[in-house]
């Protein structure tokens, strides 16, 4: 990813071609989360419909245990909506109180999991603090972006908190990826 | 779209082969709503610029009557963006005076029209509470997306409050789709 | 820009084909930014890390002083999140006072710059009122969509208020751009 | 706690097949990637290839390639090694590892000798 | 392959030294990994990413550098420091590690 790779301008047919419907492509959407044990400070990983309604996984690309595996290197297009939804956040109890108000935050993480590097690498992080005042509230974090990723890596969804995330709708709360 | 589709892995040119300027592609902005009669329950669509400014549609997709046509069956990418603005909303007026708190929301939901199906499919939703405590604000939901979709299906943007969509400039709302 | 092409529907191969890594491609991550003088009502341009990390630019797709340059004219698509953070908006402080009560706002541009047009062009703009009554706020801005460039157009990100851009990681903050 | 443990016959006869399995224990084997390094007498470390469990992806060093399979069976918790045509040169002890998104671990390794 | 020179191959240190071995990659890495290897035991991961400390590994032990050139250092040597120390790259295919640097007492 260091540098610059200049094409020749003059060469208009590259090699290898490909039909982009051959191209490896995911769609998850939401289910009820199941809840599990996480370790502590990490993120609990959100888990996915791979094949029913709108989701769906083609070419390779598989949904195995929480995680979209890559099945060729190459630069992919990466995306998540999570819904959020909750009681009048603790922040505007605390300030009612008179207590030190430091806000909640609703917080959603797109991850990669790769063999060379013994860390997650955090590609896209959408955060918001909540100070909300109405006794419910709800909203989406969207995220999106480019990266080059590996074959064999592999890509979740953390959430900061699973008992906030909407389930209830398919269109509400999704993930997924497809190689450009 | 419910099972994986494995390629062979020894292939490298697939077929059919297509330049990519050729796909269908739109980018839609907005401007201002008039006021219809919609459906109780169903929440109004927006119409669109498309040929103005920033929009167009290329490659046989088309736009009418505040649907995008897709011409071709395929993996299409789905956007939108809607900016909302409006005056104090009712939830903290009504908060003010000690009656139930519910808040008031916003809504973004891009659906999927196919005339062999009865019911339109809503394949992106992006809902906020609002409890805002000053007298202006303004916000815009995002929403994108990936989708198989089918020659002939249509696509809308609907809204929950029309009024409430700020239409005066096309780089606040704005709606799109391209061939993968 | 302005109406729609045809292509035949019969013809399957079209030409130029060209392979899909060979795409100019940019993924721009924050860096910590350094206070520069700008124009009375022009909101300051963002400048990126372009090759640390996750960020990088390829296929003739170049990074420099501010801008991405668009190597060669197609359709592209173009993103960019901007994470804010800031204390208790003004908004707040003067409502309490009495006084009127304007909100403040956060606000993503994402411009074009096209050397044969003297005005910049808004492409996409992310435009958020903060009324937040929590001392400590923090939130995203997300903007995509696909536009028409030509080689040589030139493509920023102008904020409202520089010193409220979270600055601290690269998956918080970021701009890319890539040939469809 | 999390535990590899590489076993396999300790002897191999020249020109025939290496076979050493791995079990884990104390981990979701699916959430990694496991790998084979080897070590010969009074050499360094040599990594072999990896296998990326929940898919099935390998990669395999190039001096090896024609020679290493890895395989894994999720059910039984198990990563596989195959070495074929084996010649004194791969007597080593060979251990398997764990990398991607948590700390690396190593198994304690398992001795084989080649030789007739 | 990405070739990994470490130097020196052995070294011998009085305990409270510092003591810094080098890593040179013949082309440039983004990452390095430091790994500590007693006599008949698996090798251990001590430093990821070039300079990040592993969870339970000693503050006196550090990694830094950058592209081909990375440097290991033990801050002040302890007895139990006694062993061989690797360099390994994980970027290329295949991985590859140095050849080892012996840390003794003198």
């Known amino acids: 990813l260091k540098g610059q790779e200049f094409a020749p301008s003059h060469q208009q047919v590259y090699a290898p071609l490909r039909a982009d419907g051959d191209k490896p492509r995911a769609h998850l959407t939401v289910v009820r989360q199941t809840p599990t044990q996480h370790l502590k400070n990490q993120f609990p990983a959100l888990h996915w419909e791979h094949e029913l309604g709108l989701a769906f996984t083609k070419n390779r690309m598989n949904y195995t245990n929480k995680f979209l595996l890559i099945p060729e290197s190459g630069d992919y297009f990466v995306y998540s909506q999570v819904t959020f939804r909750g009681m009048t956040s603790e922040c505007s109890e605390i300030r009612q109180a008179g207590r030190p108000n430091k806000p909640d935050s609703i917080t959603v993480v797109i991850t990669k999991v790769t063999d060379s590097y013994p860390e997650p690498t955090q590609l896209l992080m959408g955060t918001k603090s909540v100070c909300e005042v109405g006794s419910n509230w709800f909203q989406p974090i969207y995220l999106g972006a480019m990266f080059s990723l590996q074959e064999g890596d592999k890509l979740m969804v953390n959430v900061s908190d699973i008992s906030l995330v909407d389930y209830t709708k398919e269109d509400k709360t999704f993930f997924g990826a497809f190689l450009l | 779209l419910k099972g994986q589709e494995f390629a062979p892995s020894h292939q490298q040119v697939y077929a059919p082969l297509r330049a990519d300027g050729d796909k269908p592609r739109a980018h839609l902005t907005v401007v201002r709503q008039t006021p219809t009669q919609h459906l109780k329950n169903q929440f109004p669509a927006l119409h669109w610029e498309h040929e103005l400014g920033l929009a167009f549609t290329k490659n046989r997709m088309n736009y009418t009557n505040k649907f995008l046509l897709i011409p071709e069956s395929g993996d299409y990418f789905v956007y939108s963006q809607v900016t909302f603005r409006g005056m104090t909303s009712e939830c903290s007026e009504i908060r003010q005076a000690g009656r139930p708190n519910k808040p008031d929301s916003i809504t973004v939901v891009i659906t999927k029209v196919t005339d062999s199906y009865p019911e339109p499919t809503q394949l992106l939703m992006g809902t906020k509470s609002v409890c805002e405590v000053g007298s202006n604000w303004f916000q815009p939901i995002y929403l994108g997306a990936m989708f198989s979709l089918q020659e002939g299906d249509k696509l809308m943007v609907n809204v929950s409050d029309i009024s409430l969509v700020d239409y005066t400039k096309e780089d606040k709302t704005f709606f799109g789709a391209f061939l993968l | 820009l302005k109406g729609q092409e045809f292509a035949p529907s019969h013809q399957q191969v079209y030409a130029p084909l060209r392979a899909d890594g060979d795409k100019p491609r940019a993924h721009l991550t924050v860096v910590r930014q350094t206070p520069t003088q700008h124009l009375k009502n022009q909101f300051p341009a963002l400048h990126w890390e372009h090759e640390l990390g996750l960020a990088f630019t390829k296929n003739r797709m170049n990074y420099t002083n501010k801008f991405l340059l668009i190597p060669e004219s197609g359709d592209y698509f173009v993103y960019s999140q901007v994470t804010f953070r800031g204390m208790t908006s003004e908004c707040s402080e003067i409502r309490q006072a009495g006084r009127p009560n304007k909100p403040d706002s956060i606000t993503v541009v994402i411009t074009k710059v096209t050397d044969s047009y003297p005005e910049p062009t808004q492409l996409l703009m992310g435009t958020k009122s903060v009324c937040e009554v929590g001392s400590n706020w923090f939130q995203p801005i997300y903007l995509g969509a696909m536009f028409s460039l030509q080689e040589g157009d030139k493509l920023m990100v102008n904020v409202s208020d520089i010193s409220l851009v979270d600055y601290t990681k690269e998956d918080k903050t970021f701009f890319g751009a890539f040939l469809l | 706690q999390v535990q590899l443990q590489e076993s396999g016959p300790g002897l191999v006869r020249p020109s025939q097949t290496l076979s050493l399995t791995c079990t884990v224990s104390?981990?979701?084997?699916?959430?990694?990637?496991m790998h084979w390094v080897r070590q010969r007498p009074g050499r360094g470390l040599e990594w072999m290839g990896r296998?990326?469990?929940?898919?099935?992806?390998?990669k395999y060093n190039p001096s090896l390639k024609s020679r290493v399979t890895i395989t894994r069976d999720t059910s039984k918790n198990q990563v596989s090694l195959r070495l074929s045509s084996v010649t004194a040169a791969d007597t080593a002890v060979y251990y398997c590892?764990?990398?991607?998104?948590?700390?690396?671990?190593w198994g304690q390794g398992s001795l084989v000798t080649v030789s007739s | 392959d990405i070739q990994m020179t470490q130097s020196p191959s052995s070294l011998s240190a009085s305990v409270g030294d510092r003591v810094t071995i080098t890593c040179r990659a013949s082309?440039?890495?983004?990452?390095m990994y430091w790994y500590q290897q007693k006599p008949g035991k698996a090798p251990k991961l001590l430093i990821y990413?070039?300079?990040n400390l592993a969870s339970g590994v000693p503050s006196r032990f550090s990694g830094s550098g950058s592209g081909t050139d990375f440097t290991f250092t033990i801050s002040s040597l302890q007895p139990e420091d006694i062993a061989t120390y690797y360099c390994?790259?994980?970027?290329?295919?295949?991985?590859?590690f140095g050849q080892g640097t012996k840390v003794e007492i003198k």
């Open positions: 390994q790259q994980w970027e290329g295919n295949p991985r590859t």
């Open positions: 990413g070039a300079s």
């Open positions: 590892v764990r990398s991607g998104g948590l700390p690396d671990v």
């Open positions: 296998i990326e469990p929940a898919g099935g992806h390998t």
């Open positions: 082309q440039g890495v983004e990452y």
């Open positions: 104390g981990f979701d084997m699916q959430s990694t990637y």
